[in-house]
C-alpha cells in the first residue's frame, strides 16, 4: 500500500507529510490506524494535523505507529500510511542505523550534504551541523541553506553528518536533529 | 457537467499531419492535468501522451516521440495534438481525456472522456 | 513500461453470475490501479481506482481488489449493461499503460 517509514526522536518535533499528495486545494483527514481515532487539528494537542502534514510537537516514544491518511477531492477519496516510529535518544555518540537517512556520496567538486527532511519545518538559518557529535568549525565548512557544502573534499571527510535546527510553531521552539553517512568517491 | 469535445480528426495521407482539438468546459480546465489516449480500430487502449496543468510539462509515448506534440491554451481551455510524420499504424480513434487528481511527478486515473475523433493514415 | 496482462480474454456468462476478472503486471504498481468499462462507440467509463475504490455513481455489484502485481475485478451479479470491454490501467509511472481488455459476453 502506499506507505512511507519516518522516524524521530523523543523530545524533539517530528513533522511527517501524507505520501499520498493532493492538490493544495484538498483536505486531509488524519487517523491513528490502531483506534481508528481521529488526530485533531486544534494546534494546541502536541499531536495534531494540519493539512497534508502531522506534527508531533515533541514526539513521544509512544506516539509509534501507523497513521492514516485520507486526501479527499471533490470525488475521489485517496489513502497513504506513515509508518512512524519514535526512539529514545541513544546514551552513546554513536548513531545507530535505524535512526540514519540515506547515505550520500561527494567529491572534490560536489561535496553538498543536505539536511534530511528539513524542508517539512518551519526553521531559520542557520544550520548546526556536528561529524561524529563533533560540532565543525574552521573555514573548510559552510552551512549554506539547508546544505553543507565542504571544500577541498578529502577521503576523511567521511562519516557521519548531523543536521541540528530549531522548529517554531506559534512561538514554541522544538529542537530537530537528522543524520546521514557521507562518503567520499574518487573524481 | 464536465464535458470534452474532439475535432480534427479525418482521413490523410502517410507522412502528413493533423492537429486534433479538445474543447473543454464545465471545470477549471488550468488545473487540470490532460491526456491523449487513442485506440486503433478493434483494439485496446493506448496512451499517447500527457500535459501538466498550469506547469505545462509533457510527456509522449515511444511510439510518438518526436512526431507529436501536445499543448494546451488555457485561456481557451482547450486541448491539442499535433501529429506529423503520420504512419498507417497512427489509424485509431484519439480520445481526450482527464487526470482529475495528479501533481507534479505522480500520474492518476481518467475520470471523464471525450467522445474521440477517428484519425484515418492511408493512401 | 509496465506490462498489464489481463485474463481471461472473454468471459462467457449469463446475467446474475458472478464475474471475476484478472489483471498482472510486470513489476509492483503498489495500488495505483483503475479498471475501466467501455462499450461499443462508447468511451471508456472509470468504474474503480487505486485497485479497490468504487468511482463516484458505480453500483456496488462493482469491487476491485489486489495490490503489488495481482488484481482482481470481480462484478458480483451481472446486469444486462455490464456485458462490455473492461481494462485495466496502472498509472504508478509513465508511460500510463492498458491492459489488452477482457470482453465479458452473453453466453
Known amino acids: 500500500k502506499f506507505s512511507k517509514q519516518s522516524w524521530g526522536l523523543e523530545n524533539e518535533a517530528l513533522i511527517v507529510r501524507c505520501p499520498r499528495q493532493g492538490k493544495p486545494s484538498y483536505t486531509v483527514d488524519w487517523y491513528y490506524s490502531q483506534t481508528n481515532k481521529s488526530i485533531p487539528t486544534q494546534e494546541r494537542n502536541r499531536v495534531f494535523a494540519s493539512g497534508q502534514l502531522l506534527k508531533f510537537l515533541p514526539a513521544a516514544v509512544a506516539d509509534s505507529g501507523i497513521y492514516t491518511c485520507i486526501v479527499r477531492s471533490p470525488t475521489f477519496n485517496r489513502t497513504g500510511y506513515a509508518n512512524v516510529t519514535i526512539y529514545k535518544k541513544p546514551p552513546s555518540c554513536n548513531v545507530p542505523d535505524y535512526l540514519m537517512y540515506s547515505t550520500v556520496s561527494g567529491s572534490e567538486k560536489n561535496s553538498k550534504i543536505y539536511c534530511p527532511t528539513i524542508d517539512l519545518y518551519n526553521w531559520t538559518a542557520p544550520l548546526e551541523w556536528f561529524k561524529n557529535c563533533q560540532a565543525l568549525q574552521g573555514s573548510r565548512y559552510r552551512a549554506h541553506k539547508s546544505f553543507l557544502v565542504i571544500d577541498n573534499v578529502m577521503t576523511e571527510d567521511a562519516g557521519d553528518y548531523t543536521c541540528k535546527f530549531i522548529h517554531n510553531e506559534n512561538g514554541a521552539n522544538y529542537s530537530v536533529t537528522a543524520t546521514r553517512s557521507f562518503t567520499v568517491k574518487d573524481e | 457537467e464536465v464535458q470534452l469535445l474532439e475535432s480534427g480528426g479525418g482521413l490523410v495521407q502517410p507522412g502528413g499531419s493533423l492537429r486534433l482539438s479538445c474543447a473543454a468546459s464545465g471545470f477549471t480546465f488550468s488545473i487540470y492535468d490532460m491526456i491523449w489516449v487513442r485506440q486503433a480500430p478493434g483494439k485496446g487502449l493506448e496512451w499517447v501522451s500527457s500535459i501538466r496543468g498550469e506547469g505545462g510539462g509533457t510527456y509522449y509515448a515511444d511510439s510518438v516521440k518526436g512526431r507529436f506534440t501536445i499543448s494546451r491554451d488555457n485561456s481557451k481551455n482547450t486541448l491539442y495534438l499535433q501529429m506529423n510524420s503520420l504512419r498507417a499504424e497512427d489509424t485509431a480513434v484519439y480520445y481526450c481525456?482527464?487526470?482529475?487528481?495528479?501533481?507534479?511527478?505522480?500520474?492518476?486515473?481518467?475520470?471523464?472522456w471525450g467522445q474521440g475523433t477517428l484519425v484515418t493514415v492511408s493512401s | 513500461e509496465i506490462v498489464l496482462t489481463q485474463s481471461p480474454a472473454t468471459l462467457s456468462l449469463s446475467p446474475g453470475e458472478r464475474a471475476t476478472l484478472s489483471c498482472r503486471a510486470s513489476?509492483?504498481?503498489?495500488?495505483?490501479l483503475a479498471w475501466y468499462q467501455q462499450k461499443p462507440g462508447q468511451a471508456p467509463r472509470l468504474l474503480i481506482y487505486d485497485a479497490s475504490n468504487r468511482a463516484t455513481g458505480i453500483p456496488a455489484r462493482f469491487s476491485g481488489s489486489g495490490s503489488g502485481t495481482d488484481f482482481t475485478l470481480t462484478i458480483s451479479s451481472l446486469e444486462p449493461e455490464d456485458f462490455a470491454v473492461y481494462y485495466c490501467q496502472q498509472y504508478i509511472t509513465a508511460p500510463l499503460t492498458f491492459g489488452q481488455g477482457t470482453k465479458v459476453e452473453i453466453k
Open positions: 513489476q509492483s504498481v503498489d495500488d495505483d
Open positions: 481525456a482527464r487526470d482529475p487528481w495528479s501533481t507534479e511527478g505522480s500520474f492518476f486515473v481518467l475520470d471523464y
